[in-house]
Interface confidence: medium
């Protein structure tokens, strides 16, 4: 038992309209879906479209990144009156969709979110029988996904002058706030990089010159968690090497 | 026919970890998936979580630090677990039943739903 | 998130009357809007969907209306045995949202 729900209105901030006879080509979509990573998110669109009753071929395609160019992630077909739209892509497996094309519904669903899921995805349609027509979200919907911090790498590097430096780079959504702690620091933010282009959620903090032998340990905080990681610097004296 | 039960200690002490059982019937855990609802004595319903029939997870993300949810689909049991709890924890819990995924056209929405249980948390 | 106002919190019927609740959501939600009953003491029950979408088994005397964010259950002839705590549900986004309830009593 399928229940349909459309909304056919255009009061929508993210409705998008192409002027037809009778019904017209419409989508509707959130602006955003937020969600946290390692969850799963429902991105949901809607359509409405002029050609009544029909049930021939079609295919529903999501795309990310940008609209008709980006990427697919997804897209299934469905044969002449059918009601399944079988999958012919998935990207890892991941994307499934929930929605009954047959019934203007491609929400899809996508399992285990990870920060680089967080972009702007399209859905589209296409007919593909008697009649030959195709509709796509221009603006799409944002899938805005947020994470606890991660320490993804902290080491310690040589320097000119013998000397020694720290760095520590960490992942989150938002991004999160590093602070270095160890001999003779008390709580430093050292020398914190903005997230790289590209690399959004990464935040490195370096610590210059480390003057002093011990552990120095990197803290990242965000509104949703912290992590902590710790390396050590020991120098052989009267030697030019250290063990970390 | 369709039952979801709730089950698990009706008190629990300020900052230990709330735990709570849903055992259902009449349908399969590999189809359906089962959502956590909670109302505070004379409040109205907050959700917590859903679990989807193929174990995927989404969380209310004010909730999500403190809640842990899994299932034994063979046990048809999906369980709850709340940790850290406070006073404002307390509530009648309720686990309901998330419609089939596939093509429903409905897809937060709770068709059935249990009796309820009420955790109390107190010292 | 999305915030659902439900007005008004309580009413007072009289047997046979026709009974309206409404329910704003804070952004659009293109009708994917539910609306639970719960009757004292008891679990709630799911009675639309979909906005307007009458559950089987829901009396016919229920209805739902609306559209983008605003909408209504309207219950066309008051009966005994509606008295309830009705809820209103938005699922086009998560966190999923329910109204604060309406409290529907009889004169």
């Known amino acids: 038992f399928v229940r349909t729900k459309i909304d056919t209105t255009e009061n929508l901030l993210n409705t998008e309209v192409h002027s037809s006879p009778a019904q017209r080509w419409s989508m509707q979509v959130p602006p955003e879906v937020s969600a946290e990573a390692g969850d799963a998110a429902v991105l949901p669109c809607t359509f409405t479209h002029p050609h009544r009753h029909y049930d021939g071929p079609l295919t529903a395609i999501w795309r990310a990144g940008e609209p008709y160019a980006g990427p697919q992630v997804f897209r299934c077909a469905a044969a002449r009156g059918s009601e399944l739209c079988q999958t012919a892509l998935s990207l890892h497996g991941r994307f499934r969709l929930l929605g009954n094309p047959r019934r203007n519904d491609l929400s899809l669903r996508v399992e285990r979110l990870a920060l680089a899921d967080d972009r702007r995805y399209f859905c589209r349609v296409e007919f593909a029988g008697d009649v030959h027509d195709r509709y796509e979200s221009r603006h799409g919907v944002r899938l805005h996904v947020t994470a606890a911090p991660r320490i993804v790498n902290i080491s310690v590097l040589p320097s000119p002058a013998h000397a020694f430096r720290a760095l520590c780079t960490a992942e989150g959504e938002p991004p999160p706030a590093l602070a270095w702690s160890g001999p003779a620091l008390g709580n430093s933010l050292a020398a914190v990089r903005s997230p790289r282009e590209g690399h959004g959620h990464l935040v490195t903090a370096e610590l210059p010159a480390l003057t002093h032998d011990g552990r120095y340990t990197c803290t990242a905080a965000n509104s949703l968690g912290r992590s902590e990681a710790s390396v050590y610097l020991f120098r052989f004296h009267g030697a030019s090497g250290a063990s970390t | 026919q369709v039952q979801l039960q709730e089950s698990g200690p009706g008190l629990v002490k300020p900052s230990e970890t709330l735990s709570l059982t849903c055992t259902v019937s009449?349908?399969?855990?590999?189809?359906?998936?089962v959502h956590w609802v909670r109302q505070p004595p004379g409040k109205g319903l907050e959700w917590i979580v859903l679990?989807?029939?193929?174990?995927?997870?989404t969380y209310n993300s004010a909730l999500k630090s403190r809640v842990t949810i899994s299932k034994d689909t063979s046990k048809n049991q999906v369980s709850l677990k709340l940790s850290s709890v406070t006073a404002a924890d307390t509530a009648v819990y309720y686990c309901?039943?998330?419609?089939?995924?596939?093509?429903?056209?409905?897809?937060?929405?709770?068709?059935?739903w249990g009796q309820g249980t009420l955790v109390t948390v107190s010292s | 998130d999305i915030q659902m106002t439900q007005s008004p919190s309580s009413l007072s019927a009289s047997v046979g009357d026709r009974v309206t609740i409404t329910c704003k959501a804070s952004?659009?939600?293109?009708?994917?809007l539910a609306w639970y009953q719960q009757k004292p003491g008891k679990v709630p029950k799911l009675l639309i969907s979909?906005?307007?979408s009458l559950e089987t088994g829901v009396p016919s005397r229920f209805s739902g209306s609306g559209s983008g964010t605003d909408y209504t259950l309207t219950i066309s002839s008051l009966q005994p045995e509606d008295v309830a705590t009705y809820y209103c549900?938005?699922?086009?986004?998560?966190?999923?949202?329910f109204g604060g309830g309406t409290k529907v009593e009889i004169k």
């Open positions: 309901a039943r998330h419609p089939y995924d596939d093509y429903s056209g409905y897809y937060y929405t709770m068709d059935y």
């Open positions: 009449g349908f399969s855990l590999s189809n359906y998936g």
């Open positions: 679990i989807w029939s193929d174990g995927s997870t």
């Open positions: 952004d659009h939600i293109n009708n994917w």
């Open positions: 979909g906005a307007t």
């Open positions: 549900q938005q699922y086009w986004s998560s966190p999923l949202t």
